[in-house]
């Protein structure tokens, strides 16, 4: 029987800069029941605090609700593991909420095949930002990425959409059923999970164009840019 091994705080994430959760990995248990506690203080403060909520984030976690979350302060935290034989402490982790944001996936992904009479057909998609993110405050700039593939294909084709919530793609295989997904990330932070897949059947008479792909501006009614395959690689994030 031994004191517990050193725990490690391995991840902290915030969905929206208003709340955040941190998770730790226990060290070895020393063969005895072990209690874990997370303590922290904020930059410029010597008063120590304890995790306010060990439940919401699941096992080995600490959740900081709105009244415990500040964008403007660095948190300095550590986890203490204690059993009957002694204690051990994790290394201190410095957490700035601004840099740990991982949003929920975008919502309401809609995909349609558009076949205008005077132009080539294209795949048009639009989506909404995740509900927890308030873009009106200016605290957030969300960037989007789309991926799609024929249903039976192994490889995804990925497109960077910038801040747009609408996107057009030419160059699809006629007669194929495609899966389309979208994800987002804040300017500082982590990519969300991919949204649930939306399926779209490409008509057999869809005109294939391998040379060009069409990406819309934010307003589809506005000017549109033709981007060559070569230029498009600058927009790819695989």
């Amino acid at each position: 029987q031994l004191p517990p091994g050193k725990p490690e705080i391995f991840k902290c994430r915030s969905p929206n800069k208003e709340t955040f959760t941190c998770w730790w990995r226990p060290g070895t248990d020393g063969g005895l029941p072990t209690n874990y506690s997370l303590t922290y203080h904020r930059e410029g403060e010597t008063l120590m605090h304890e995790c306010p909520d060990y439940i919401t984030g699941g096992p080995n976690s600490c959740h900081f609700g709105k009244q415990y979350t500040s964008m403007w302060r660095t948190y300095v935290m550590m986890v203490n593991a204690t059993n009957q034989m002694g204690s051990s402490f994790s290394d201190e982790l410095y957490v700035d909420v601004t840099y740990i944001v991982q949003p929920d996936p975008p919502l309401e992904l809609t995909v349609e095949v558009k076949q205008p009479e005077d132009r080539k057909p294209y795949l048009w998609m639009k989506w909404s930002p995740p509900t927890l993110i308030d873009l009106k405050t200016g605290w957030f700039t969300l960037l989007y990425e789309i991926r799609l593939k024929p249903e039976k294909a192994a490889e995804w084709e990925t497109h960077f959409a910038g801040q747009q919530t609408e996107f057009k793609i030419l160059s699809l295989h006629p007669g194929q059923k495609y899966l389309v997904q979208v994800r987002c990330k804040p300017d500082h932070g982590y990519w969300s999970a991919w949204s649930p897949a939306t399926f779209i059947q490409i008509p057999s008479d869809f005109i294939m164009n391998d040379e060009q792909k069409l990406i819309s501006e934010e307003d589809l009614g506005g000017e549109q840019k033709l981007i060559s395959e070569e230029d498009l690689h600058h927009h790819h994030h695989h």
Partner: antibody
Framework: EVHLVESGGGLVQPGGSLRLSCAAS????????MNWVRQTPGKGLEWISH????????YYADSVKGRFTISRDNAKNSLFLQMNSLRAEDTAVYFC???????????WGQGTLVTVSS | EIVLTQSPATLSLSPGERATLSCRAS??????FAWYQQKPGQAPRLLIY???SRATGIPTRFSGSGSGTDFTLTISSLEPEDFAVYYC?????????FGQGTRLEIK
């Protein structure tokens, strides 16, 4: 609606003991850092003890260290202050207060009077 | 411990006037600083936290400023219910300490 209700105050002789209780309702007691604050006409407001959500972190003011013990029972939404070796200068209104790190929302009871006199 | 000194001890003003209350800390408390209002027979009520953020339900006429060692509470236009005792408080380090109070009274 939030309520913090202190009880256990009263008249006690110097050297005696009292146990103050604070019953909490209407908020997530187990998430809050809880505190005892006292107010005397002479010294004004004095923050005397602090206990973290699961009692891992406890602070005492030097004036009560070694004599007072703070504790909590999250299952019963209750905060306690065991006061031993009481002195005349401990005479005060004792408030319990629930705070977060920013103090919002911040909840206070209405206080219980402790009088130490022979 | 960090000592907080409030000035003035008493401030006599009329409703509608502007009140400026000051508090100086014996060492830097960053912005971990609060202001309270207390009326007779009541518990203190949090007005301002983190030096300049208004607590829930506090009217906009109350504002806080400052960082480090010098802090100010301003009441832009006094209402009759604002006459009370005001305390400053630091939450940077233990022991948490209060100032001795400023009594705001009707002139």
């Amino acid at each position: 609606e939030v309520h913090l209700v202190e009880s256990g105050g009263g008249l006690v002789q110097p050297g005696g003991s009292l146990r103050l209780s604070c019953a909490a309702s209407g908020f997530t007691f187990s998430s809050y850092e809880m505190n005892w604050v006292r107010q005397t006409p002479g010294k004004g407001l004095e923050w005397i003890s602090h206990i973290s959500s699961r009692s891992v972190i406890i602070y005492y003011a030097d004036s009560v260290k070694g004599r007072f013990t703070i504790s909590r029972d999250n299952a019963k939404n209750s905060l306690f202050l065991q006061m031993n070796s009481l002195r005349a200068e401990d005479t005060a209104v004792y408030f319990c207060a629930g705070i977060t790190i920013f103090g919002i929302p911040e909840y206070w009871g209405q206080g219980t009077l402790v009088t130490v006199s022979s | 411990e960090i000592v907080l000194t409030q000035s003035p001890a008493t401030l006599s003003l009329s409703p509608g006037e502007r009140a400026t209350l000051s508090c100086r800390a014996s060492q830097s408390v960053s912005s971990y600083f609060a202001w309270y209002q207390q009326k007779p027979g009541q518990a203190p009520r949090l007005l301002i936290y983190d030096a300049s953020s208004r607590a829930t339900g506090i009217p906009t006429r109350f504002s806080g400023s400052g960082s480090g060692t010098d802090f100010t509470l301003t009441i832009s236009s006094l209402e009759p219910e604002d006459f009370a005792v005001y305390y400053c408080q630091q939450r940077s380090s233990w022991p948490i300490t209060f100032g001795q109070g400023t009594r705001l009274e009707i002139k």
